[in-house]
Interface confidence: low
């Protein structure tokens, strides 16, 4: 730990004296205490030496020297008294704020240690400190109130006897706050309310606070409602309640209701919406498109929101087909909030047989309502190329399946190659109107494209390339001259 020169723990000087406090340490140090503006730091050794050329009672206090590099190494203190018969007290603060239950330090420091046995604490106006207030005097710190209470809030003066005469400090205002000094806690119940015209309703506005001095009102819009106030006192908290009870609600009762509670600290407000409807309702909506497209193997969640009053009594998710073989049990959850439900259907790694219609049905006193999703699966193209003579002419057939409907491009390339792009191709044909062989709902589209060649050219490779939003695929056909025969080679190329 650092060493202070002169050695302490206390130093007593007369007003007007020069006082130098030096802190000796291996590293840089920092002084803490009632320093500014009564001291100067020695420019030769900044941080380590404090000097005052003309000590006054305001220099009275505890000075601490701490090592900056290693605060854990500890610190050293010295308490300086500047004994001035004209000023028995040095006040380090005029106002002290603590939380109830804490120690409250009233920092009136005695300037002469010889006076410490005759000190006393009084309330301003010459009144004694409250009998239940437990306090003691520390010459270095001042008067310390143990377990300060709200009742201890007051202006205090410190007194001592100097040469048989009373010397009194100026006042220190002690403010003792509650553990939670804040506006009242409020609750407005329910947080949302719907009623059919003619039904009964209750809105309860309640507030709790540690002190009794607070107010609570219930408003509809800007209108303060004249409702009797019920009060209670529980576990040392005051509770005030205004409850609006309506036997048969009408449309004029609807609106925004506010619960407002206020005290000296501030105001808290809670609001809720009261809706009056003509009859029961059940509305089903989805933020998603009702026409869903996903790739085979993907997962998705179908989400439906229901706004309903009164409560939904029954609901169910149903698969309406068209594929009824190999059906998994539907997995869904329901989340409920006030007058609002969220229904979620989980479709995990969907298979071909799970495409189709999904139907949510819900019922309350308003009747039944439903919503249908159509789930179409996307498939990458699958391609097959065949050759057939038609009326003595060579024709290549490209059969393609997939969803969405794939596009078809033919390419003629020189040589026996298994790769060919448009830049290398001798000819390119885009089939903009292939023949649709099959187009069933929720299933793959099957199309056929024909390439009438006339006579297959020797040493050429013909490619049928297909593409959709999911992927692409191609297959080639080679013309091999073996007399009059045409041969489809064994190898074929498929690129998903």
């Amino acid at each position: 730990a650092p060493v202070i020169e002169p050695s302490g723990p206390e130093l007593v000087v007369e007003p007007g004296e020069t006082v130098t406090l030096r802190c000796v340490s291996n590293g840089s140090v920092e002084w803490d205490g009632p320093i500014s503006p009564y001291w100067t730091l020695d420019p030769e050794s900044p941080g380590s030496t404090l000097t005052t050329r003309n000590a006054t009672f305001k220099n009275t206090g505890t000075y601490r020297c701490t090592e900056l590099e290693d605060p854990m190494a500890g610190s050293t203190t010295i308490h300086l008294y500047v004994k001035d018969p004209a000023h028995s007290w040095n006040l380090l603060a005029q106002e002290v704020t603590v939380v109830e239950g804490q120690e409250a330090v009233l920092p009136c420091l005695i300037t002469d240690p010889a006076l410490k046995d005759s000190v006393s604490l009084m309330r301003e106006g010459g009144r004694q400190v409250l009998r239940k207030t437990v306090y003691f005097f520390s010459p270095w710190r001042g008067f310390i109130i143990r377990k300060a209470k709200v009742l201890d809030s007051n202006t205090y003066v410190c007194k001592t006897m100097v040469n048989g005469r009373e010397s009194t400090s100026t006042g220190i205002w002690l403010k003792v706050n509650r553990v939670h000094p804040e506006p009242p806690q409020i609750k407005l119940e329910p947080s949302k309310l719907v009623r059919i015209r003619g039904e009964a309703a209750q809105i309860v506005c309640s507030a709790t606070n540690a002190e009794v001095g607070f107010n609570v009102i219930l408003k509809r819009g800007d209108t303060k409602l004249e409702i009797p106030l019920n009060s209670d006192f529980q576990d040392n908290y005051y509770k005030k309640v205004r409850a609006l009870s309506l036997n048969a609600v009408d449309f004029q009762d609807a609106g925004i209701y506010s619960c407002v509670a206020s005290n000296d600290v501030g105001t808290r407000t809670a609001t809720m919406n009261f809706q009056v409807v003509e009859s029961a309702y059940l509305n089903l909506t989805s933020e998603q498109s009702l026409l869903q497209e996903v790739s085979v193997g993907d997962s998705l969640i179908l989400t439906v929101h229901a706004d309903a009053y009164p409560s939904i009594q029954h609901y169910n998710w149903t698969y309406l087909g068209p594929f009824f073989e190999d059906q998994r049990k539907l997995e869904f959850i329901t989340q409920r909030a006030i007058y609002r439900y969220t229904f979620k259907l989980f479709l995990n790694r969907v298979k071909a047989s799970e495409a189709g219609q999904y139907f949510l049905m819900a019922q309350n006193k308003a009747g039944w309502n439903n919503l249908t999703f159509e789930l179409t699966l996307r498939y990458p193209p699958e391609v097959s190329v065949t050759w057939m003579p038609v009326n003595g002419s060579d024709v290549l057939f490209c059969d393609v399946s997939g969803y969405p409907q794939p596009s078809v491009t033919w390419m003629e390339c020189r040589g026996h190659t298994d790769r060919c792009d448009e830049a290398q191709a001798l000819q390119v044909w885009n089939d903009t109107h292939p023949e649709v062989l099959s187009q069933k709902p929720f299933d793959k589209v099957i199309i056929q494209s024909q390439l009438p060649i006339g006579t297959l050219k020797h040493n050429m490779t013909y490619f049928c390339k297909t593409h959709n939003s999911v992927g692409n695929s191609s297959q080639y056909f080679r013309a091999v001259s073996l007399g009059q025969s045409k041969q489809l080679p064994d190898e074929s190329l498929f690129t998903p």
Epitope: R131, V150, R178, F233, Q234, D235, N236
Partner: antibody, heavy 119, light 106 residues
């Protein structure tokens, strides 16, 4: 010095009534919340009643509500507990205590008085 | 009502450190208070608001915790500390006490 002395206990038959007293001295009785807490044999402490400094507000747990009545006389610096329809489970040592003004804990306790309910 | 659970009994030797726990069935913030009751005597407040030492109580006694878990510590234990120690909550209504922990010295 603060003192609280309970009296009025003893052996009572089930169904009968009893009034306990607590004479307080050495402190400003009228400034304090007061309470009764009991300790039944082989059981823990149980708070049974509290009263505000003025006597305007009284507080009871549900377990004794309607059978126990707490009251005070600030002029006589005395606290009372009226116990009606006594049951065997009311057998306990009853303590009067000062309740802290800001929180419901009990900072000073009397010596206690034993109430035995038995036929 | 809020239930406070304490271990029923402990036996320690003088000079040792002893810790008594109090668990609440629901949060009680820091409104837990500790009492000592010696045989044949009235209870005495030792700690209030979880950690505040009542004036006149030796610094050997201390308390800590908030929410639902609280600890009361005596360090070091003295022969005169033989007693039953109760925790009490005042956050929820009604105020309730724990069942007490009987501390015996070996």
């Amino acid at each position: 010095d603060r003192q609280m002395v309970e009296s009025g206990g003893g052996l009572v038959r089930p169904g009968r009534s009893l009034k306990l007293s607590c004479a307080a001295s050495g402190f400003t009785f009228s400034n304090y919340y007061m309470a009764w807490v009991r300790l039944a044999p082989s059981k823990g402490l149980e708070w049974v009643a509290s009263i505000s400094p003025s006597g305007d507000n009284t507080y009871y747990p549900d377990s004794v509500q309607g059978r126990f009545t707490i009251s005070r006389d600030n002029a006589e610096t005395t606290l009372y507990l009226q116990v009606d329809s006594l049951r065997s489970e009311d057998t306990a040592t009853y303590y009067c205590a000062t309740r802290h003004y800001g929180y419901s804990f009990f900072d000073y306790w009397g010596q206690g008085v034993l109430v035995t309910v038995s036929s | 009502d809020t239930v406070l659970t304490q271990s029923p009994a402990l036996a320690v030797s003088p000079g040792e450190r002893v810790t008594i726990s109090c668990r609440a069935s629901e949060s009680v913030s820091t409104l837990i208070h500790w009492y000592q009751q010696k045989p044949g005597q009235q209870p005495k407040l030792l700690i209030f608001l979880a950690s505040h030492l009542e004036s006149g109580v030796p610094a050997r006694f201390s308390g800590s915790g908030s929410g639902t878990d609280f600890t009361f510590t005596i360090d070091p234990v003295e022969a005169d500390d033989t007693a039953t120690y109760y925790c009490q909550q005042s956050w929820n209504d009604p105020p309730t006490f724990g069942g007490g922990t009987k501390l015996e010295l070996k």
